[in-house]
Protein backbone atom coordinates (compact mmCIF):
# COMPACT_ATOMS: atom_id res chain seq x y z
CA UNK A 1 0.00 0.00 0.00
CA UNK A 2 1.85 3.34 -0.89
CA UNK A 3 2.15 5.31 2.10
CA UNK A 4 -0.04 8.85 2.01
CA UNK A 5 2.18 11.56 1.13
CA UNK A 6 1.84 15.75 2.03
CA UNK A 7 1.10 17.37 -0.84
CA UNK A 8 2.98 20.95 -0.89
CA UNK A 9 1.75 23.62 -3.02
CA UNK A 10 5.18 24.43 -4.48
CA UNK A 11 7.46 22.37 -7.17
CA UNK A 12 9.15 19.15 -5.63
CA UNK A 13 13.10 19.01 -4.81
CA UNK A 14 14.83 19.10 -8.11
CA UNK A 15 15.82 16.48 -10.06
CA UNK A 16 19.25 15.01 -9.33
CA UNK A 17 19.37 17.29 -6.36
CA UNK A 18 22.52 15.10 -4.27
CA UNK A 19 24.27 14.88 -7.51
CA UNK A 20 23.96 18.35 -8.00
CA UNK A 21 25.04 19.82 -4.58
CA UNK A 22 28.26 17.47 -4.64
CA UNK A 23 29.19 18.15 -8.38
CA UNK A 24 29.08 22.08 -7.29
CA UNK A 25 30.59 21.85 -4.72
CA UNK A 26 33.50 20.07 -6.34
CA UNK A 27 33.31 22.59 -9.51
CA UNK A 28 33.20 25.26 -6.81
CA UNK A 29 36.59 24.44 -5.02
CA UNK A 30 38.16 23.62 -8.25
CA UNK A 31 37.64 26.97 -9.85
CA UNK A 32 38.24 28.62 -6.47
CA UNK A 33 41.58 27.36 -4.94
CA UNK A 34 41.22 28.97 -1.91
CA UNK A 35 38.34 26.90 -0.73
CA UNK A 36 39.98 23.63 -1.94
CA UNK A 37 40.57 23.26 2.25
CA UNK A 38 36.88 21.94 2.66
CA UNK A 39 35.48 18.46 1.89
CA UNK A 40 32.16 18.14 -0.27
CA UNK A 41 31.19 15.17 1.28
CA UNK A 42 30.82 16.88 4.70
CA UNK A 43 29.63 19.64 2.77
CA UNK A 44 26.96 17.48 0.97
CA UNK A 45 26.16 15.47 4.56
CA UNK A 46 25.58 18.92 6.81
CA UNK A 47 23.10 20.24 4.13
CA UNK A 48 20.90 16.89 4.16
CA UNK A 49 21.27 16.77 7.97
CA UNK A 50 19.61 20.34 7.69
CA UNK A 51 16.39 19.26 5.79
CA UNK A 52 16.09 15.51 6.03
CA UNK A 53 13.80 13.73 8.24
CA UNK A 54 12.66 16.87 9.57
CA UNK A 55 9.18 18.92 8.65
CA UNK A 56 9.85 21.12 5.82
CA UNK A 57 7.84 23.51 7.65
CA UNK A 58 9.63 23.63 10.88
CA UNK A 59 13.11 24.46 9.48
CA UNK A 60 15.59 26.86 11.57
CA UNK A 61 18.43 28.83 11.06
CA UNK A 62 19.93 26.63 13.40
CA UNK A 63 19.28 23.47 11.19
CA UNK A 64 21.82 24.96 8.60
CA UNK A 65 24.81 25.89 11.45
CA UNK A 66 26.82 23.01 10.85
CA UNK A 67 26.50 23.87 6.49
CA UNK A 68 27.14 27.37 7.79
CA UNK A 69 30.67 26.96 9.43
CA UNK A 70 31.94 24.11 6.49
CA UNK A 71 30.97 26.86 4.05
CA UNK A 72 32.67 29.67 6.04
CA UNK A 73 34.36 31.70 3.53
CA UNK A 74 36.23 35.54 3.51
CA UNK A 75 34.98 37.61 0.72
CA UNK A 76 36.23 41.39 0.62
CA UNK A 77 34.07 42.93 2.72
CA UNK A 78 33.68 46.31 0.66
CA UNK A 79 32.97 44.00 -2.96
CA UNK A 80 29.59 42.90 -2.12
CA UNK A 81 26.90 43.37 -4.57
CA UNK A 82 23.34 42.89 -3.52
CA UNK A 83 20.54 42.46 -5.63
CA UNK A 84 16.77 42.43 -5.72
CA UNK A 85 14.37 40.71 -9.22
CA UNK A 86 17.49 41.41 -11.09
CA UNK A 87 19.89 37.97 -10.43
CA UNK A 88 21.03 37.36 -14.01
CA UNK A 89 22.33 41.44 -14.57
CA UNK A 90 23.60 41.00 -11.22
CA UNK A 91 25.70 37.74 -12.09
CA UNK A 92 26.54 39.25 -15.63
CA UNK A 93 28.23 42.16 -13.77
CA UNK A 94 30.39 39.79 -11.51
CA UNK A 95 31.67 37.65 -13.86
CA UNK A 96 32.83 40.79 -15.73
CA UNK A 97 33.70 42.86 -12.16
CA UNK A 98 35.43 39.62 -10.85
CA UNK A 99 36.54 41.84 -7.92
CA UNK A 100 33.01 41.83 -6.56
CA UNK A 101 30.73 39.00 -5.31
CA UNK A 102 27.19 38.29 -4.96
CA UNK A 103 25.62 35.94 -2.64
CA UNK A 104 26.27 33.56 -5.23
CA UNK A 105 29.93 33.71 -6.08
CA UNK A 106 30.18 32.43 -2.38
CA UNK A 107 30.18 28.67 -2.37
CA UNK A 108 27.14 28.29 -0.33
CA UNK A 109 25.02 31.03 -2.83
CA UNK A 110 26.59 28.63 -5.66
CA UNK A 111 25.71 25.55 -4.45
CA UNK A 112 21.95 26.56 -3.83
CA UNK A 113 21.08 28.82 -6.65
CA UNK A 114 18.06 28.46 -8.17
CA UNK A 115 17.41 24.44 -6.38
CA UNK A 116 14.26 23.67 -4.36
CA UNK A 117 14.78 20.63 -1.90
CA UNK A 118 12.82 19.65 1.13
CA UNK A 119 12.39 16.43 3.06
CA UNK A 120 9.66 14.30 5.09
CA UNK A 121 8.98 14.23 8.76
CA UNK A 122 10.41 11.19 10.22
CA UNK A 123 11.46 9.52 6.75
CA UNK A 124 15.08 9.94 5.15
CA UNK A 125 13.48 10.06 1.94
CA UNK A 126 14.26 13.66 -0.33
CA UNK A 127 10.32 14.90 -1.41
CA UNK A 128 10.45 15.14 -5.31
CA UNK A 129 7.02 15.48 -5.91
CA UNK A 130 6.21 18.51 -3.79
CA UNK A 131 7.69 21.41 -1.05
CA UNK A 132 6.39 24.04 0.83
CA UNK A 133 5.40 27.10 -0.97
CA UNK A 134 6.52 30.26 1.17
CA UNK A 135 2.73 31.67 0.71
CA UNK A 136 0.63 29.29 0.12
CA UNK A 137 1.81 26.90 3.00
CA UNK A 138 4.57 28.15 5.32
CA UNK A 139 8.06 30.40 5.69
CA UNK A 140 9.75 28.11 7.55
CA UNK A 141 10.21 25.54 5.03
CA UNK A 142 13.96 24.14 3.65
CA UNK A 143 14.56 26.43 0.90
CA UNK A 144 13.61 30.35 2.37
CA UNK A 145 15.19 29.52 5.84
CA UNK A 146 18.58 28.72 3.73
CA UNK A 147 18.74 32.14 1.55
CA UNK A 148 17.32 33.95 4.81
CA UNK A 149 20.64 32.47 6.82
CA UNK A 150 23.00 33.17 3.57
CA UNK A 151 21.64 36.21 3.25
CA UNK A 152 21.73 37.46 6.62
CA UNK A 153 25.41 36.45 7.39
CA UNK A 154 26.35 37.81 3.79
CA UNK A 155 24.79 41.39 4.78
CA UNK A 156 26.06 41.44 8.04
CA UNK A 157 29.60 40.73 6.21
CA UNK A 158 29.28 43.82 4.53
CA UNK A 159 31.67 46.98 4.59
CA UNK A 160 32.14 50.60 3.43
CA UNK A 161 30.06 50.72 0.28
CA UNK A 162 27.69 47.94 0.18
CA UNK A 163 25.94 48.06 -3.40
CA UNK A 164 22.53 46.97 -4.31
CA UNK A 165 21.44 46.53 -8.16
CA UNK A 166 17.40 46.73 -8.40
CA UNK A 167 14.83 46.35 -10.80
CA UNK A 168 13.35 49.73 -12.15
CA UNK A 169 11.15 47.40 -14.24
CA UNK A 170 8.88 46.73 -11.39
CA UNK A 171 6.27 48.08 -9.94
CA UNK A 172 7.65 48.19 -6.64
CA UNK A 173 11.22 48.70 -7.45
CA UNK A 174 12.73 48.07 -3.88
CA UNK A 175 10.46 45.55 -2.05
CA UNK A 176 9.76 45.20 1.66
CA UNK A 177 8.81 41.95 1.28
CA UNK A 178 12.28 40.15 -1.01
CA UNK A 179 15.01 39.21 0.58
CA UNK A 180 16.67 42.35 0.34
CA UNK A 181 14.19 44.30 1.76
CA UNK A 182 13.63 42.13 4.74
CA UNK A 183 16.68 40.36 5.62
CA UNK A 184 19.77 42.26 4.05
CA UNK A 185 19.08 45.74 4.83
CA UNK A 186 18.07 45.34 8.13
CA UNK A 187 21.60 43.29 9.00
CA UNK A 188 23.84 45.45 7.19
CA UNK A 189 26.51 46.95 9.84
CA UNK A 190 25.85 50.90 10.76
CA UNK A 191 29.26 50.78 12.20
CA UNK A 192 31.19 49.04 8.92
CA UNK A 193 28.71 50.16 6.07
CA UNK A 194 28.94 53.85 5.46
CA UNK A 195 27.06 53.68 2.26
CA UNK A 196 24.39 51.75 0.64
CA UNK A 197 24.92 52.47 -3.80
CA UNK A 198 21.65 51.49 -5.02
CA UNK A 199 21.69 50.89 -9.18
CA UNK A 200 18.22 51.24 -10.22
CA UNK A 201 18.48 49.28 -13.54
CA UNK A 202 15.77 50.80 -16.55
CA UNK A 203 13.90 48.42 -18.55
CA UNK A 204 13.04 49.90 -21.40
CA UNK A 205 14.79 51.74 -24.17
CA UNK A 206 12.96 55.22 -24.06
CA UNK A 207 13.13 55.47 -20.39
CA UNK A 208 14.63 58.81 -19.14
CA UNK A 209 12.61 59.43 -15.86
CA UNK A 210 14.80 59.67 -12.70
CA UNK A 211 13.80 56.71 -10.77
CA UNK A 212 15.83 57.54 -8.34
CA UNK A 213 12.67 59.62 -7.12
CA UNK A 214 10.26 56.85 -6.97
CA UNK A 215 8.47 56.38 -3.55
CA UNK A 216 9.93 52.93 -2.82
CA UNK A 217 13.12 54.54 -3.39
CA UNK A 218 12.75 56.92 -0.87
CA UNK A 219 11.28 54.22 1.43
CA UNK A 220 14.69 52.33 1.44
CA UNK A 221 16.76 55.44 1.84
CA UNK A 222 14.48 56.29 4.85
CA UNK A 223 15.10 52.58 6.27
CA UNK A 224 18.83 53.23 5.35
CA UNK A 225 18.98 56.76 6.90
CA UNK A 226 17.71 55.82 10.25
CA UNK A 227 20.06 53.25 10.56
CA UNK A 228 22.91 55.36 10.77
CA UNK A 229 24.18 54.81 7.04
CA UNK A 230 24.65 56.91 4.21
CA UNK A 231 22.37 55.92 0.65
CA UNK A 232 22.88 57.20 -2.66
CA UNK A 233 21.09 56.19 -5.89
CA UNK A 234 22.01 55.73 -9.65
CA UNK A 235 19.90 55.50 -12.53
CA UNK A 236 21.47 52.47 -15.25
CA UNK A 237 19.47 54.15 -17.97
CA UNK A 238 21.10 51.68 -20.16
CA UNK A 239 22.54 48.02 -18.96
CA UNK A 240 23.53 46.76 -22.22
CA UNK A 241 25.92 49.54 -22.59
CA UNK A 242 26.92 49.66 -18.88
CA UNK A 243 27.98 45.81 -18.88
CA UNK A 244 30.07 47.04 -22.06
CA UNK A 245 31.65 49.66 -19.94
CA UNK A 246 32.76 47.64 -17.52
CA UNK A 247 34.01 45.17 -20.05
CA UNK A 248 35.81 48.29 -21.60
CA UNK A 249 36.04 51.39 -19.30
CA UNK A 250 38.79 53.00 -21.56
CA UNK A 251 35.86 53.08 -24.67
CA UNK A 252 35.09 56.50 -25.64
CA UNK A 253 31.21 56.24 -25.33
CA UNK A 254 31.68 55.55 -21.79
CA UNK A 255 32.51 58.79 -20.58
CA UNK A 256 28.41 59.97 -20.96
CA UNK A 257 25.91 58.55 -18.98
CA UNK A 258 24.94 55.20 -19.06
CA UNK B 1 33.17 5.74 -20.92
CA UNK B 2 34.15 9.72 -20.54
CA UNK B 3 34.73 11.09 -24.09
CA UNK B 4 35.52 14.45 -26.00
CA UNK B 5 35.55 14.81 -29.11
CA UNK B 6 36.66 17.76 -31.26
CA UNK B 7 35.88 19.56 -34.07
CA UNK B 8 37.54 18.88 -37.56
CA UNK B 9 41.03 21.11 -38.65
CA UNK B 10 40.73 24.40 -39.84
CA UNK B 11 42.62 26.94 -41.74
CA UNK B 12 42.08 30.13 -41.20
CA UNK B 13 43.41 34.14 -42.36
CA UNK B 14 45.10 36.18 -40.55
CA UNK B 15 42.05 38.76 -38.83
CA UNK B 16 39.42 35.86 -38.81
CA UNK B 17 37.82 34.08 -36.26
CA UNK B 18 37.67 30.30 -35.44
CA UNK B 19 35.02 28.19 -33.28
CA UNK B 20 36.11 24.76 -32.43
CA UNK B 21 33.56 22.82 -30.54
CA UNK B 22 34.12 19.73 -28.28
CA UNK B 23 31.03 17.33 -27.86
CA UNK B 24 31.51 15.25 -24.58
CA UNK B 25 29.87 12.05 -23.67
CA UNK B 26 29.79 9.42 -20.88
CA UNK B 27 29.10 11.71 -18.02
CA UNK B 28 26.89 14.86 -16.84
CA UNK B 29 28.18 17.90 -18.85
CA UNK B 30 27.01 20.28 -16.13
CA UNK B 31 28.70 18.09 -13.29
CA UNK B 32 32.17 19.19 -14.45
CA UNK B 33 34.46 22.54 -15.42
CA UNK B 34 35.12 22.53 -18.78
CA UNK B 35 39.03 23.48 -19.73
CA UNK B 36 41.06 24.53 -23.03
CA UNK B 37 44.49 24.42 -23.61
CA UNK B 38 46.54 25.74 -26.60
CA UNK B 39 49.94 23.60 -27.71
CA UNK B 40 51.76 25.45 -30.64
CA UNK B 41 54.01 23.79 -33.00
CA UNK B 42 57.21 22.92 -31.33
CA UNK B 43 56.12 24.29 -28.01
CA UNK B 44 54.29 23.15 -24.75
CA UNK B 45 51.04 23.35 -23.21
CA UNK B 46 49.33 26.92 -22.52
CA UNK B 47 46.06 27.05 -20.43
CA UNK B 48 43.79 29.49 -22.57
CA UNK B 49 40.52 29.37 -19.90
CA UNK B 50 37.53 27.27 -18.16
CA UNK B 51 33.58 27.17 -18.19
CA UNK B 52 31.10 26.08 -16.04
CA UNK B 53 28.52 24.75 -18.12
CA UNK B 54 25.71 25.05 -15.79
CA UNK B 55 26.12 28.82 -15.06
CA UNK B 56 28.04 29.93 -18.49
CA UNK B 57 30.65 31.46 -16.09
CA UNK B 58 33.94 31.50 -17.42
CA UNK B 59 37.89 32.71 -16.93
CA UNK B 60 40.50 32.97 -19.28
CA UNK B 61 44.04 33.28 -18.99
CA UNK B 62 45.49 37.10 -19.14
CA UNK B 63 47.22 36.63 -22.85
CA UNK B 64 44.16 35.55 -24.69
CA UNK B 65 41.72 38.02 -22.58
CA UNK B 66 39.79 40.23 -25.33
CA UNK B 67 40.06 37.39 -27.84
CA UNK B 68 38.95 34.38 -26.76
CA UNK B 69 35.76 33.27 -25.87
CA UNK B 70 34.26 29.86 -24.39
CA UNK B 71 30.88 28.97 -24.38
CA UNK B 72 28.56 26.18 -23.34
CA UNK B 73 25.56 24.73 -25.00
CA UNK B 74 24.31 22.39 -22.57
CA UNK B 75 21.04 21.04 -24.72
CA UNK B 76 23.99 19.24 -27.21
CA UNK B 77 26.96 19.15 -24.35
CA UNK B 78 29.14 21.00 -26.24
CA UNK B 79 31.52 23.50 -25.60
CA UNK B 80 32.98 25.66 -27.99
CA UNK B 81 36.45 27.49 -28.13
CA UNK B 82 36.35 31.33 -29.69
CA UNK B 83 39.70 32.88 -30.91
CA UNK B 84 39.09 35.90 -32.98
CA UNK B 85 41.36 38.30 -34.45
CA UNK B 86 43.77 35.49 -35.55
CA UNK B 87 47.33 36.11 -36.24
CA UNK B 88 50.58 33.60 -37.29
CA UNK B 89 51.31 32.59 -33.61
CA UNK B 90 47.63 31.31 -32.87
CA UNK B 91 48.74 28.62 -35.84
CA UNK B 92 48.34 25.20 -32.92
CA UNK B 93 46.58 22.52 -31.28
CA UNK B 94 43.77 23.29 -29.32
CA UNK B 95 42.49 20.72 -26.99
CA UNK B 96 39.37 20.64 -24.22
CA UNK B 97 40.25 19.10 -21.31
CA UNK B 98 38.05 17.93 -17.89
CA UNK B 99 39.39 16.84 -14.19
CA UNK B 100 38.73 13.77 -12.35
CA UNK B 101 36.69 13.39 -9.37
CA UNK B 102 38.48 11.30 -6.80
CA UNK B 103 35.61 10.68 -3.74
CA UNK B 104 34.40 14.34 -3.98
CA UNK B 105 37.22 16.07 -4.76
CA UNK B 106 38.63 17.52 -8.17
CA UNK B 107 41.85 15.76 -8.97
CA UNK B 108 43.25 19.22 -9.90
CA UNK B 109 44.86 17.20 -12.66
CA UNK B 110 43.01 17.26 -16.33
CA UNK B 111 42.19 13.61 -16.46
CA UNK B 112 40.66 13.48 -19.75
CA UNK B 113 41.79 15.54 -23.16
CA UNK B 114 39.79 15.85 -26.65
CA UNK B 115 42.05 14.28 -29.37
CA UNK B 116 42.69 17.98 -30.61
CA UNK B 117 42.08 20.27 -32.92
CA UNK B 118 44.62 21.95 -35.30
CA UNK B 119 44.20 25.21 -36.60
CA UNK B 120 46.48 26.99 -39.02
CA UNK B 121 46.58 30.99 -39.60
CA UNK B 122 47.60 31.33 -42.83
CA UNK B 123 47.20 34.11 -45.62
CA UNK C 1 51.80 33.76 -12.34
CA UNK C 2 53.67 30.42 -11.24
CA UNK C 3 57.03 29.23 -13.47
CA UNK C 4 57.35 25.48 -14.18
CA UNK C 5 60.62 24.73 -15.17
CA UNK C 6 62.13 21.25 -16.36
CA UNK C 7 65.28 19.35 -16.64
CA UNK C 8 66.31 18.10 -18.51
CA UNK C 9 64.81 19.28 -22.42
CA UNK C 10 66.03 15.80 -23.54
CA UNK C 11 66.30 12.57 -21.77
CA UNK C 12 68.12 9.52 -24.00
CA UNK C 13 67.44 6.31 -21.88
CA UNK C 14 68.08 2.51 -22.65
CA UNK C 15 65.15 0.47 -22.13
CA UNK C 16 65.23 -1.08 -19.27
CA UNK C 17 67.39 1.48 -17.15
CA UNK C 18 65.82 4.07 -14.74
CA UNK C 19 64.89 7.44 -16.17
CA UNK C 20 64.58 10.49 -14.12
CA UNK C 21 62.80 14.36 -14.74
CA UNK C 22 63.20 17.12 -12.43
CA UNK C 23 60.62 19.98 -12.24
CA UNK C 24 61.12 23.06 -10.41
CA UNK C 25 58.16 25.40 -9.14
CA UNK C 26 59.29 29.38 -8.32
CA UNK C 27 56.67 29.00 -5.24
CA UNK C 28 55.33 26.61 -2.85
CA UNK C 29 53.11 24.48 -4.71
CA UNK C 30 51.70 23.09 -1.05
CA UNK C 31 48.07 23.30 -0.61
CA UNK C 32 47.16 24.30 3.30
CA UNK C 33 44.59 20.96 2.62
CA UNK C 34 47.97 18.94 2.75
CA UNK C 35 47.50 18.51 -1.15
CA UNK C 36 50.46 19.60 -3.42
CA UNK C 37 48.96 20.27 -6.44
CA UNK C 38 51.78 19.02 -9.37
CA UNK C 39 50.62 17.08 -12.27
CA UNK C 40 52.67 15.04 -14.54
CA UNK C 41 51.99 14.41 -17.84
CA UNK C 42 53.07 12.46 -21.10
CA UNK C 43 52.59 12.83 -24.61
CA UNK C 44 53.20 10.28 -26.52
CA UNK C 45 53.91 11.44 -30.73
CA UNK C 46 50.61 12.41 -32.37
CA UNK C 47 48.52 11.94 -28.84
CA UNK C 48 46.62 14.14 -26.61
CA UNK C 49 48.40 14.71 -23.36
CA UNK C 50 47.97 11.57 -20.77
CA UNK C 51 47.63 12.72 -16.88
CA UNK C 52 50.02 9.99 -15.29
CA UNK C 53 50.32 11.36 -11.29
CA UNK C 54 48.34 14.12 -9.84
CA UNK C 55 49.09 15.49 -6.35
CA UNK C 56 52.17 15.25 -6.58
CA UNK C 57 52.40 11.50 -5.69
CA UNK C 58 48.89 9.84 -6.44
CA UNK C 59 49.03 7.41 -9.74
CA UNK C 60 46.16 8.39 -12.27
CA UNK C 61 43.48 5.21 -13.06
CA UNK C 62 45.69 2.99 -15.35
CA UNK C 63 49.33 4.24 -14.99
CA UNK C 64 51.88 1.57 -14.35
CA UNK C 65 53.32 1.47 -11.26
CA UNK C 66 56.51 2.01 -12.69
CA UNK C 67 55.76 5.71 -12.61
CA UNK C 68 55.91 7.19 -9.50
CA UNK C 69 56.08 11.53 -8.28
CA UNK C 70 58.02 12.73 -5.18
CA UNK C 71 58.95 15.75 -4.45
CA UNK C 72 58.82 18.69 -1.91
CA UNK C 73 57.02 21.97 -1.77
CA UNK C 74 59.11 23.75 -4.90
CA UNK C 75 61.31 20.82 -5.94
CA UNK C 76 59.35 17.71 -8.03
CA UNK C 77 60.49 14.38 -9.79
CA UNK C 78 59.28 11.77 -11.78
CA UNK C 79 60.80 8.39 -11.75
CA UNK C 80 60.19 5.46 -14.54
CA UNK C 81 62.35 2.50 -12.42
CA UNK C 82 62.84 0.80 -15.90
CA UNK C 83 61.77 2.82 -19.38
CA UNK C 84 59.98 0.64 -21.69
CA UNK C 85 59.69 1.77 -25.41
CA UNK C 86 55.96 2.86 -25.34
CA UNK C 87 57.15 5.56 -22.69
CA UNK C 88 58.65 7.98 -25.64
CA UNK C 89 57.17 11.32 -25.93
CA UNK C 90 57.33 14.65 -23.70
CA UNK C 91 56.87 14.42 -20.09
CA UNK C 92 55.09 17.92 -18.75
CA UNK C 93 54.65 18.71 -14.85
CA UNK C 94 51.92 21.28 -14.27
CA UNK C 95 50.99 23.28 -11.41
CA UNK C 96 47.65 23.60 -10.47
CA UNK C 97 47.90 25.54 -7.20
CA UNK C 98 46.09 28.48 -8.33
CA UNK C 99 45.46 30.26 -11.84
CA UNK C 100 46.18 30.21 -14.37
CA UNK C 101 47.65 26.42 -14.46
CA UNK C 102 50.98 26.68 -15.89
CA UNK C 103 53.02 23.96 -17.33
CA UNK C 104 56.74 23.19 -17.62
CA UNK C 105 59.01 23.24 -21.16
CA UNK C 106 58.48 19.44 -21.19
CA UNK C 107 61.14 16.64 -21.11
CA UNK C 108 61.66 14.61 -24.00
CA UNK C 109 62.30 11.05 -23.90
CA UNK C 110 63.69 9.05 -26.17
CA UNK C 111 65.36 5.47 -26.40
CA UNK C 112 68.71 5.36 -27.22
Known amino acids: VPRWRQQWSGPGTTKRFPETVLARCVKYTEIHPEMRHVDCQSVWDAFKGAFISKHPCNITEEDYQPLMKLGTQTVPCNKILLWSRIKDLAHQFTQVQRDMFTLEDTLLGYLADDLTWCGEFNTSKINYQSCPDWRKDCSNNPVSVFWKTVSRRFAEAACDVVHVMLNGSRSKIFDKNSTFGSVEVHNLQPEKVQTLEAWVIHGGREDSRDLCQDPTIKELESIISKRNIQFSCKNIYRPDKFLQCVKNPEDSSCTSEI | EVQLVQSGAEVKKPGATVKISCKVSGYTFTDYIMHWVQQAPGKGLEWMGWIDPEYGSTDYAEKFQGRVTITADTSTDTAYMELSSLRSEDTAVYYC????????????????WGQGTLVTVSS | DIVMTQSPLSLPVTPGEPASISCQSSESLLHSNGKTYLNWYLQKPGQSPQLLIYWMSTRAAGVPDRFSGSGSGTDFTLKISRVEAEDVGVYYCQQFLEYPPTFGQGTKLEIK
Open chain 2, 97 to 112: ARVAIITTVASGGFAY
